[in-house]
Each structure stands twice: as structure tokens, then as C-alpha cells.
């Protein structure tokens, strides 16, 4: 591989690590609710409107807002650049998507609506661990705009377990975002939908190469992250929200100091929720696992303002709204590592059904 | 094993045209097709410099210096990224590399490209 970056250094951005989190439920107070983008089929185990959920409006105060799920004039072309075997997408033509790839009209897809009370409390989901996450500010990493979303490519070294025998290799983590008055989460809890999400994506050591584990079981795994918004700023983002301005054209690249890639993550890697997806972009691979936190990250409004307005996408559209809607569940179950279920009783329920990467 | 493989360096006099090619080989089809695409350089005792790229979304975007002579393009159906250089001058001169970035980088082992008379 070629060494290094020339005249595309990032300036240093100091500050403490700390991510500052909150808890999801029903404390949480919300940006804004939306109705479910793709509502499962009738079959008996998912209505198709979670904000039927009264208990769960009424203690949130929440109002039954139904808003557009990704808006046809957001960003890109969509998928009709066929010359050349093009494979452009965007969210704003996800029903092109499978056009694109097959696999994105696949049953196990991924982002899902985290109905509570639907999930299933598994004791053998155990505490994630990371390791080598608190990266030193040399060598530098790429941050990039690809038109889609801002992107850090991690070193190698960043290590993480899922359980014993489940070991993964961080690649990149990005961000998905929405507006300055719509949020924009890929994934929703009860319905709701958070300003933003952070994903971190790992692949199986199992697998020397990303290509060989594309649609394996187990073979790519992501650990997600909600953002959302309070009075501190976030010293740990600010690292990487310092720099958007310099990466603001789509196909910017610069380099930026190392930084703590755990800080960007809830400190609580114990509470979280579990199940088999996909990648939530074309090629939408499935076989994906996904480790969604409890915890929020807390991001001021100034730096979620500073996410959502500060990079551009193709046809000199801003870079906004970049989420997939929620996707059926298809007699998926959640599994979660804590009692998640409102009505939960104190023993674990539906322990059968936990599964571990590869199965 | 994903291999990208570069060819269409070699010698050409200042003002010349050449036109680079990167085949992406091995079992990287669904990869290639999804990936920000680029092409890199590196002069003699320089660093690496992005040359062009083709995002994942379909923009492009050149370095100033090749602005208006260089145009980048992909055929995903032939899994291959080209160059196509106008109007060579000698600090043109370096290896190019190759860049497939979809979650994890792939490079290829350059090409060597000498503007000279």
C-alpha cells in the first residue's frame, strides 16, 4: 500500500473523551416521532403501527407525526446513470435499490423499528468488548465525504468481541443524519426516531477480506449508536465535526489526527439489542449482526446543526436525511442483554431463541 | 484475494496523452460496483496525492493541478476504473495508483507514468 497522504492534514482538536450518554425510554424526550416507514406483513407479530403504542405516546408526549421517510429530492441520482454499468444510488430512490443490488429486497434487511416490548431478554448476551479503540493522534486517519455520508477509516488494531470466539476488526464507522428540524436515525425505538446514528463497521476475523464475508452469517457485524441532542458539547465528536467543513464536496478526502473511537460510543457496552440484518446501503448484504446500545450519545445542538448542514452530495444538493427506512422484521426477533420489555417479567424470556454470529 | 491491477503507464513526451486502466480481479464484483473509486499519485520523493475519484454516489472530483486534463470514468460492468490523461506535462510524472474503497481500502501496485523528452 502507497504511504501516506500528502497536503491533507487535519488540525488537532483537543478535548476530553468523554461521550456523555443517556438512556433510551421513556425519559427520553424526542425530536420528533415518526410513523413506521414499511410496516410488517399481517401476520400476527407486528402491527403495522407502532405509534398505536398509547402507553408509550402518552409518557412521552408524543404526537403521532407522520413524516416523509427519505424525500425524493434528497441527494444523488437516482439509479438511472445505468451507462457503463453504473451502480449510482440514493435515498431518495430506495425502491431502485434492488435494481441496484438483489439482495437489497431480501427478508432479513436492515434498519428496523426496536418495538420494547416485543423483545426478548437473553442473559448470554454479555458486556462487548473493544480493544484498542483509544487510537493516539499519529498516524492520522482518512475522513472522507463519498456523496452518501462522512466516513473514518479505522487502523488496524481496533478489536472488538461480540462473545467468546466472535472476534471482529473494526473497518470504518460513519454517520447518518437528517435536517435541522427532521432526525434522522436508521434505526427507531417504539417508533421514534433519533437526531442521528453512528455506526462502527467490524469484520469477522474469520474472514481476511471484506469481499469474502459479504452475506456470510456473522461475517460483518455493526455496532450502532443513537445521537441525540444536550446542553454540553461533545469534546469526543467535536474531533471529528471540526473537520467537516474541510471535506464539505463530495469526494473530499483529508487526513485528521487519531482520536478515542470508543469515546464516540456509549459508555455502557452492556445494555443493547441484537439481531441479523444487513448492510442498510446498497449492496445491502445480509448476515449483518447488529449491536444497537441503550445508551444515547449526547451531541450539542450546535454540532448536530454542524453534522446536517455542513457537507454537500452530488448535483450540489446538501448531504442530508441519509437513512434507510425501517424494514420488516419478518419473525425476526430482537434479543436484548437487559430487560428491555416494559411488561418484562424478572426471568428471561424466549432464552431458545438467542443466537450467536454464524449460526 | 481482490487484485487491482493498473496498466497504460509508460513514456510519453510532454503534451501527450495517456490513458490508465485498473482491473479489479478475484471475487470483487459486489464490491467494486458500491466502492468510491480513485486514483492516486506519488512523484519521486513525494507523497501520495489524489489524483481524481468517483464517489460511491457518482461524483468526481480532481486535484487542481489535473483539472481540465485528466478525466476519471468507471465501467462496473467490466469491474475497471480508467484515467484518461491529456496534455502531459513532466511534473506529471510519478506512479499511479489504483484505490477501491468500500469499508475497507483495496490498493493496487501502480504504474508507472514518465513525461519526458
Known amino acids: 500500500q502507497p504511504q501516506g497522504l500528502s497536503g491533507m492534514q487535519g488540525e488537532p482538536s483537543l478535548g476530553d473523551s468523554s461521550s456523555g450518554e443517556d438512556e433510551l425510554g421513556v425519559d427520553v424526550l424526542p425530536s420528533e416521532e415518526d410513523a413506521p416507514e414499511e410496516a410488517d406483513p399481517p401476520d400476527g407479530e407486528d402491527p403495522p403501527e407502532v405509534n398505536s403504542e398509547d402507553r408509550m405516546e402518552e409518557s412521552l408526549g408524543l404526537e403521532d407525526l407522520s413524516t416523509p421517510e427519505a424525500p425524493e429530492h434528497s441527494q444523488g441520482s437516482h439509479g438511472d446513470e445505468k451507462g457503463g454499468g453504473h451502480s449510482h444510488w440514493s435515498y431518495g430512490g430506495t425502491l431502485l435499490w434492488p435494481q441496484v443490488s438483489p439482495a437489497c429486497a431480501g427478508r432479513f434487511q436492515s434498519p428496523v423499528d426496536i418495538r420494547l416490548e416485543r423483545t426478548a431478554f437473553c442473559r448470554t448476551l454479555q458486556p462487548l468488548e473493544l480493544l484498542g479503540y483509544e487510537l493516539q493522534p499519529l498516524p492520522e486517519l482518512s475522513l472522507s465525504n463519498n456523496g452518501h455520508t462522512v466516513q473514518l477509516t479505522l487502523p488496524p488494531g481496533l478489536k472488538m468481541a461480540l462473545g467468546p470466539g466472535q472476534e471482529y476488526r473494526a473497518l470504518q464507522l460513519h454517520l447518518h443524519w437528517g435536517t435541522s428540524d427532521h432526525p434522522g436515525s436508521e434505526h427507531t425505538v417504539n417508533g421514534h426516531r433519533f437526531p442521528a446514528e453512528i455506526h462502527v463497521v467490524h469484520l469477522s476475523t474469520a474472514f481476511s477480506e471484506l469481499h469474502e464475508a459479504l452475506g456470510r452469517p456473522g461475517g460483518l457485524a455493526v455496532l450502532a449508536a443513537f445521537l441525540q441532542e444536550s446542553p454540553e458539547e461533545n469534546s469526543a465528536y467535536e474531533q471529528l465535526l471540526s473537520h467537516l467543513e474541510e471535506i464539505s464536496e463530495e469526494g473530499s478526502k483529508i487526513e485528521i489526527p487519531g482520536l478515542d473511537v470508543s469515546a464516540l460510543l456509549p459508555s455502557d457496552l452492556s445494555r443493547y439489542y441484537r439481531y441479523e440484518g444487513s448492510l442498510t446501503t446498497p449492496p445491502c448484504s445480509q448476515g449483518v449482526i447488529w449491536t444497537v446500545f441503550n445508551e444515547t450519545v449526547k451531541l450539542s445542538a450546535k454540532q448536530l446543526h454542524t453534522l446536517s448542514v455542513s457537507l454537500w452530495g452530488p448535483r450540489d444538493s446538501r448531504l442530508q436525511l441519509n437513512f434507510r427506512a425501517t424494514q420488516p422484521l419478518n419473525g425476526r426477533t430482537i434479543e436484548a442483554s437487559f430487560p428491555a420489555a416494559e411488561d418484562s417479567s424478572p426471568e428471561p424470556v424466549h432464552v431458545n431463541s438467542c443466537f450467536t454470529a454464524g449460526d | 484475494q481482490v487484485q487491482l491491477v493498473e496498466s497504460g503507464g509508460g513514456l510519453v513526451q510532454p503534451g501527450g496523452s495517456l490513458r490508465l486502466s485498473c482491473s479489479a480481479s478475484g471475487n470483487s464484483a459486489n464490491i467494486f460496483s458500491f466502492a468510491s473509486v480513485a486514483w492516486y499519485r506519488q512523484a519521486p520523493g513525494k507523497g501520495l496525492e489524489l489524483v481524481s475519484v468517483i464517489t460511491s454516489a457518482g461524483g468526481t472530483k480532481y486535484s487542481d493541478s489535473v483539472k481540465g486534463r485528466f478525466t476519471i470514468s468507471r465501467d462496473n460492468s467490466k469491474n475497471t476504473l480508467y484515467l484518461q490523461m491529456n496534455s502531459l506535462r513532466a511534473e506529471d510524472t510519478a506512479v499511479y495508483y489504483c484505490?477501491?474503497?468500500?469499508?475497507?481500502?483495496?490498493w493496487g501496485q501502480g504504474t508507472l507514468v514518465t513525461v519526458s523528452s
Open positions: 484505490n477501491v474503497d468500500y469499508l475497507q481500502d483495496y
